[in-house]
């Protein structure tokens, strides 16, 4: 912790200026008034304080605002944001997208994923929902950050906003997040024609149920293997060999490359070897001919 000393009269600070660069940590602690610092936060980022000095300034703000900083201070944190922990950020109430932009810019190139995720979460809470302006800001200033939001937060996205989301914004989304986003995307793109619909819905398909994947297989979409590999395991397992062949079209040959990887491996184990052989890809591991498949899960559910 910072040692407490009294401020020498000649070092008293009346404004936040560049001379503070040459204040030792104990002098900053003793001589900088926290209220003055908060009022002149906009000056701090123009001064190349070291990380040690920023620690002292953060300590001052923490003492002044134990319940969390006001947005007027947050907006001007600049490089001081790099000193914030997710726990600090959880105390904030942020509604301004200008504040979000400023802090996203500062965090670029630094290992700040947890802090950024918490910040975005606070913005969504502060604004009440994940509106189009927020999504536009995230896609412009922090590609991939949309996926840092919890499924609960993503559930506040109105379907009308889904169109602003680009494929690369969903690259890091997990299954639970896509489960939330997919129905919204389906609703948002429902009036589009077959091929246009597929292009739009493709990045969200990691959240699609079996019946929707089956429906796509009837539309000659020629799904690429990368998209197929991102489908939910539960959505792929019930598909027949014929359905997968129709779904992938010319890309079906890629199954051989992926036969050891989920969900392809799991799907192969559920198919009759005879059916797999019709693909002519040499896929192995299907159910041998003459074997009876018992679905024990049904019996377990009844007992």
């Amino acid at each position: 912790d910072v040692e407490r000393t009294t401020c020498p009269p000649e070092k008293e600070v009346h404004e936040i200026d560049e001379s503070l660069i040459f204040y030792k940590k104990r002098e900053l602690e003793a001589c900088v008034d926290a209220a003055l610092l908060a009022a002149q936060m906009d000056r701090v980022d123009a001064i190349p304080f070291t990380y040690e000095q920023l620690d002292v300034l953060k300590h001052k703000l923490d003492e002044l605002y134990p319940q969390g900083y006001p947005e007027s201070v947050i907006r001007h944190l600049g490089h001081l944001f790099l000193k914030m922990s997710p726990e600090d950020i959880r105390k904030w109430n942020v509604t301004s997208l200008e504040t979000l932009k400023a802090l996203l810019k500062v965090s670029k190139g630094h290992e700040m994923s947890a802090q950024v995720a918490t910040l975005i979460d606070r913005v969504v809470v502060g604004r009440g929902q994940l509106d189009k302006d927020t999504v536009d800001t995230l896609t412009a200033f922090c590609p991939g950050c949309l996926c840092s939001l919890s499924p609960e937060r993503l559930s506040s996205v109105p379907p009308s906003v889904i169109g602003a989301v680009r494929p690369q914004d969903l690259d890091t989304c997990g299954p639970r997040q896509l489960d939330v986003l997919y129905p919204k995307a389906r609703l948002a793109f429902q009036n589009m024609s077959g091929s246009e619909y597929f292009v739009k819905i493709r990045p969200f398909l990691g959240g699609a149920p079996t019946e929707d994947v089956k429906a796509l297989s009837q539309q000659n979409v020629s799904m690429d293997l990368a998209t197929f590999m991102k489908l939910r395991r539960e959505a792929v397992l019930p598909l027949t060999v014929a359905e997968v062949q129709k779904l992938l079209g010319p890309h079906v040959e890629g199954l051989k490359v992926e036969e050891q990887h989920s969900p392809v491996r799991d799907w192969i184990l559920k198919q009759r070897q005879d059916d797999l052989d019709t693909l002519g890809l040499g896929l192995q591991g299907g159910i041998p001919n003459g074997y009876l498949i018992l679905d024990l899960s049904v019996r377990e559910a009844l007992s």
Partner: antibody, heavy 118, light 107 residues
Framework: QVQLQQSGAELVRPGTSVKVSCKAS????????IEWVKQRPGQGLEWIGV????????KYNEKFKGKATLTADKSSSTAYMQLSSLTSEDSAVYFC???????????WGQGTLVTVSA | DIVMTQSHKFMSTSVGDRVSITCKAS??????VAWYQRKPGQSPKLLIY???TRHTGVPDRFTGSGSGTDYTLTISYMQAEDLALYYC?????????FGGGTKLEIK
């Protein structure tokens, strides 16, 4: 003890660029700022700019914006100053100095003589 | 930019003398003034900062004083090894600026 070791003298052609290095030892490089200063023969000292090796943040004298570019490599504890579009006016000794323990220009490198000549 | 003026380019002195070198800032620099010593063929060395704080290892015959715009470096008892060029500098705001220097010579 704190030491700043600068690269050797350079003879360069007008219009080209040169990169001067300043290797710090004896302290935590990222904890303190590195300043750069110019001294032309028979003239005074001129502050060029400062870099925060921890964050990479820089601040320049307006006079040297576009002329000098300051960088730092944390892994080798070395600060660099690149001077571009060199003219005879850039012929000078260039010093780096560390604001060690927050004391201004507390320790200086030995200086690097840059001579711009056709 | 803040201009730092050292009115004496040269000062004659003898060993044992008390010597005062002055420096004037073009505006109030709130005691953010440093003094450096430079000997021929060497880099500058920090002597004093914040107008009166002696840097580590600097002999106590060197003292600094002043406030506002007027600052002084005093050598209480001149030694032969103190013959050098002395610069003042303001570290109050960028661009940091130096005085033109005062050279101490033997009478």
């Amino acid at each position: 003890q704190v030491q700043l070791q600068q690269s050797g003298a350079e003879l360069v052609r007008p219009g080209t660029s040169v990169k001067v290095s300043c290797k710090a030892s004896g302290y935590a490089f990222t904890n303190y700022l590195i300043e750069w200063v110019k001294q032309r023969p028979g003239q005074g000292l001129e502050w060029i700019g400062v870099i925060n090796p921890g964050s990479g943040g820089t601040k320049y004298n307006e006079k040297f914006k576009g002329k000098a570019t300051l960088t730092a490599d944390k892994s080798s504890s070395t600060a660099y100053m690149q001077l571009s579009s060199l003219t005879s006016e850039d012929s000078a000794v260039y010093f780096c100095a560390s604001d060690y323990d927050y004391d201004p220009f507390a320790y200086w490198g030995q200086g690097t003589l840059v001579t711009v000549s056709a | 930019d803040i201009v730092m003026t050292q009115s004496h380019k040269f000062m004659s002195t003898s060993v044992g003398d008390r010597v005062s070198i002055t420096c004037k800032a073009s505006q109030d620099v709130s005691t953010a003034v440093a003094w450096y010593q430079r000997k021929p063929g060497q880099s500058p060395k920090l002597l004093i900062y914040w107008a009166s704080t002696r840097h580590t290892g600097v002999p106590d015959r060197f003292t600094g004083s002043g406030s506002g715009t007027d600052y002084t470096l005093t050598i209480s008892y001149m030694q032969a090894e103190d013959l050098a060029l002395y610069y003042c500098q303001q570290h109050y705001s960028t661009p940091y600026t130096f005085g033109g220097g005062t050279k101490l010579e033997i009478k």
